[in-house]
Amino acid sequence: QAGPLPKPTLWAEPGSVISWGNSVTIWCQGTLEAREYRLDKEESPAPWDRQNPLEPKNKARFSIPSMTEDYAGRYRCYYRSPVGWSQPSDPLELVMTGAYSKPTLSALPSPLVTSGKSVTLLCQSRSPMDTFLLIKERAAHPLLHLRSEHGAQQHQAEFPMSPVTSVHGGTYRCFSSHGFSHYLLSHPSDPLELIVSGSLEDPRPSPTRSVSTAAGPEDQPLMPTGSVPHSGLRRHWE
């Protein structure tokens, strides 16, 4: 007897982090035997939508015309073949930016830092928030994800980098959010260019050793794992 149907692949274009008001297309790719595709959204009546496959029948398209809070969340898709329904896809977490006003990102003591020294990136919001994310341009994942303990609201989060190496150089933005929805983020802060001068190369920068320099959209899940305590906020990095 044949085993379970292979799970489909689910992804979003142009990515899974979408600004308010922009369109997004969700794709579900199964097999050539697929007769129907179904998309489910967590905490919504199932199915969210059903689509016939597009030729050559191995994928289907689900569309969002203008991103709003209601579309943010976790999605899974399935396909039906002559032998039944597939396993669910891995989840797609669709995140909306623009839900809150943009925070301010600054570098202390300065965005111009000598290799081997320390710098702290400070993300400040006008209204109290409980989650802050620091994003580096062209990194596939958020660098750091700070969440306050016990839902305490804070106006800022500090992202210390020490010792700084050339890897830390680049363009950063930060977002703020409320814990009741991980899928709703603020507008991005204005970009901050961190310039590292000098040639000292420290082998293990911390805590941002996970910084990815791979090119690509910021379309990965925004929920990193692991934590250490930090000034009332929990620090997460990958």
Epitope: W48, Q51, I64, P65, S66
Partner: antibody, heavy 121, light 108 residues
Framework: EQSVEESGGDLVKPGASLTLTCAAS?????????MCWVRQAPGKGLEWIAC????????RWYASWPKGRFTISKTSSTTVTLQMTSLTAADTATYFC?????????????WGPGTLVTISS | ELVMTQTPASVEAVVGGTVTIKCQAS??????LAWYQQKPGQRPKLLIY???TLASGVPSRFSGSGSGTEFTLTVSDLECADVAAYYC??????????FGGGTEVVVK
């Protein structure tokens, strides 16, 4: 053949309410469509009123000018309504139902013939 | 609130000539712009979507260009059949499907 057709247009008095219906033929609503209402006063231009997503009834988009007097709803997988309240002479127009389509980057690719609404005492 | 401003309100041209219609969005809408043609007594017809892509069956005499906030519709080799009102529209960007005020094209 895919088509949409409006119904419910009438002559009513100022202050009255009216519900227009848009019936789709040859297709049913899905996430790849929005259904929209557009109106055109005699001798005037097109004026967008509202759109609703084919699957997500929470997602309705309105122009700012009706100020809550108009409500778009999906009543089945092939019908959409526009409820209009506190009507005035300025609401006299031909009301079109149109389909916004992801294949056309959400342009309005399919239009009904329109239904005439006249507000007069 | 996003506003679409269309110019001119009316344009007169000769058969075989060229007409250019401008459309300006009050904020950037990327390429989410559509153009429509409406002949007297008829329903509107989609001409161009995604700022420059011709809808099926539309003659290549029609062309669209632009992105962000500035867009243009050009009708070349004008024919009598092109006498109509033309409208630009933001197609869903920033949660609006707002139209421009329209341009009447008449043939001399």
């Amino acid at each position: 053949e895919q088509s949409v057709e409006e119904s419910g247009g009438d002559l009513v008095k100022p202050g009255a309410s009216l519900t227009l219906t848009c019936a789709a033929s040859g297709f049913s609503f899905s996430s790849t469509y929005c259904m929209c209402w557009v109106r055109q006063a005699p001798g005037k231009g097109l004026e967008w009123i509202a759109c609703i997503h084919g699957v997500s009834t929470n997602n309705r988009w309105y122009a700012s000018w009706p100020k809550g007097r108009f409500t778009i709803s999906k009543t089945s997988s092939t019908t959409v309504t526009l409820q209009m309240t506190s009507l005035t002479a300025a609401d006299t127009a031909t009301y079109f139902c149109a389909r916004s389509d992801t294949d056309y980057e959400w342009g309005l690719s399919l239009w009904g013939p329109g239904t005439l609404v006249t507000i007069s005492s | 609130e996003l506003v679409m401003t269309q110019t001119p309100a009316s344009v007169e041209a000769v058969v075989g000539g060229t007409v250019t219609i401008k459309c300006q969005a009050s904020e950037s809408i990327g390429s989410r712009l559509a153009w429509y043609q409406q002949k007297p007594g008829q329903r509107p017809k989609l001409l161009i979507y995604k700022a420059s892509t011709l809808a099926s069956g539309v003659p290549s005499r029609f062309s669209g260009s632009g992105s962000g906030t500035e867009f243009t519709l050009t009708v070349s080799d004008l024919e009598c059949a092109d006498v109509a009102a033309y409208y630009c529209q933001c197609a869903g960007q920033s949660s609006t499907w707002a139209f421009g005020g329209g341009t009447e094209v008449v043939v001399k």
